[in-house]
């Protein structure tokens, strides 16, 4: 019951923190205009990683996409390949995990089974939730360096007696849904690893054999018997050792001399 | 260079209804309506994108007034219904080559006066 709630958990967390990666990426305000030394002005600029938009005081308020491929910012293209996979890995681990879910009951889907998809999926949030952040963080670094930067510019010009006019931006809206979002894909991930860890079934380390009465006395062939652990050479169910044991998957037995006594 | 053509401005009691019209000598990016009251500063009223035809109105004006384009005449219109005594101003036409920013309109009108008297 803990690890259906602790999966079912999981899914959901991730899934609300997939749709927030989305829609950090799809928003315009990853980096917004600067107000603190001119809280009042005409138009208002804001950027996001598709394009950048300029608002009016009126309300009024026009974007343009980012045409070029070439001509932009080696940090922001990565920015947006990290974004890109991150919500790429993101939806192939809602898809395997959708089929993972304990509740939800596939053919004769193993639990085994389940348990390999929930760990992959697990795995696939982590990393989805991990690219979202890094995204994130390389653009506010980006923003935090710009800033500084510009700041230091401003006051340089002619002895620090003029000041020019230049737009500094500082971090948009975008960026925290992106840090929060990556962050519950992350937790999302580490759940369905946690649920998968009580959704395996506990592996024995001996195969099953059945005895069947055969005489007085039971030859074993020497150095017959091999232990088995499922991982080994022995993973057909071979005869482990010869005389009156048989694996259950055998099912003929053949006689041996001892058994006509 | 761009010339704007503007009519349909007038006097109109309160509640009543007036359309003004814009046309362009030759294709723009984007085309609308400012005004400006006297003692006031100039604001936006409405605009079109001659491309795609997506529209923008002032709060002020939604529900009241609409804009619309013909792109063979390289005409807009502002159909403006419902009048106040404060949309009384002067109405001016204008255009963009490249954007429908103030900062970057490029062509201006002349203005017609437009006056709702209560």
């Known amino acids: 019951m803990a690890v259906t709630a602790c999966q079912g958990l999981g899914f959901v967390v991730s899934l609300i923190g997939i749709a927030g990666i989305i829609a950090a990426t799809c928003m315009d305000q990853w980096s917004t205009q600067d107000l603190y030394n001119n809280p009042v002005t005409a138009v208002f600029n804001y950027q996001g990683l598709w394009r950048s938009c300029v608002r009016e005081s009126s309300g009024f308020t026009e974007c343009r996409g980012y045409f070029t491929l070439l001509g932009l910012p080696a940090m922001l293209q990565a920015v947006r390949a990290l974004m890109i996979v991150g919500i790429v890995l993101g939806a192939i681990g809602l898809l395997v995990s959708i089929f993972a879910l304990k509740c939800i009951r596939i053919g004769s889907m193993e639990d085994s089974a389940k348990a390999n998809m929930t760990l992959t999926s697990g795995i696939m949030f982590i990393v989805s939730g991990l690219c979202a952040i890094a995204g994130v963080s390389v653009f506010a670094n980006m923003l935090v360096t710009n800033f500084w930067m510009s700041t230091a510019n401003m006051y340089t010009g002619m002895g620090g007696m003029v000041q020019t006019v230049q737009t500094r931006y500082t971090f948009g809206a975008a960026l925290f849904v992106g840090w929060v979002a990556g962050g519950l894909t992350l937790i999302g991930g580490v759940m369905m690893c946690i649920a998968c860890r009580g959704l395996a079934p506990e592996e024995t380390n001996y195969k099953a054999v059945s005895y069947h009465a055969s005489g007085h006395s039971v030859a074993y062939k020497p150095g017959g018997f091999k232990a088995s652990t499922g991982f080994g050479s022995n993973t057909k169910n071979k005869k482990i050792y010869d005389g009156g044991a048989r694996t259950e998957d055998e099912v003929q037995s053949y006689p041996s001399k001892h058994d006509y006594v | 260079q761009v010339q704007l053509d503007e009519s349909g401005g007038g006097s109109v009691q309160a509640g009543g209804s007036l359309r003004l019209s814009c046309a362009a000598s030759?294709?723009?990016?984007?085309m609308g309506w400012f005004r400006q009251a006297p003692g006031k500063l100039r604001e936006r009223v409405a605009n079109?994108?001659?491309?795609?035809?997506?529209?923008w109105l002032a709060d002020s004006v939604k529900g009241r007034f609409t804009i619309s384009r013909d792109n063979a005449k390289n005409a807009v219109y502002l159909q403006m219904t419902r009048l106040r005594p404060e949309d009384t101003a002067m109405y001016y036409c204008?255009?963009?080559?490249?954007?429908?920013?103030?900062?970057?309109?490029?062509?201006w009108g002349q203005g017609t006066q437009v006056t709702v008297s209560s």
């Open positions: 204008a255009a963009g080559r490249s954007s429908c920013l103030e900062a970057s309109i490029s062509y």
């Open positions: 030759r294709s723009t990016y984007c």
């Open positions: 079109v994108y001659m491309r795609n035809g997506d529209t």
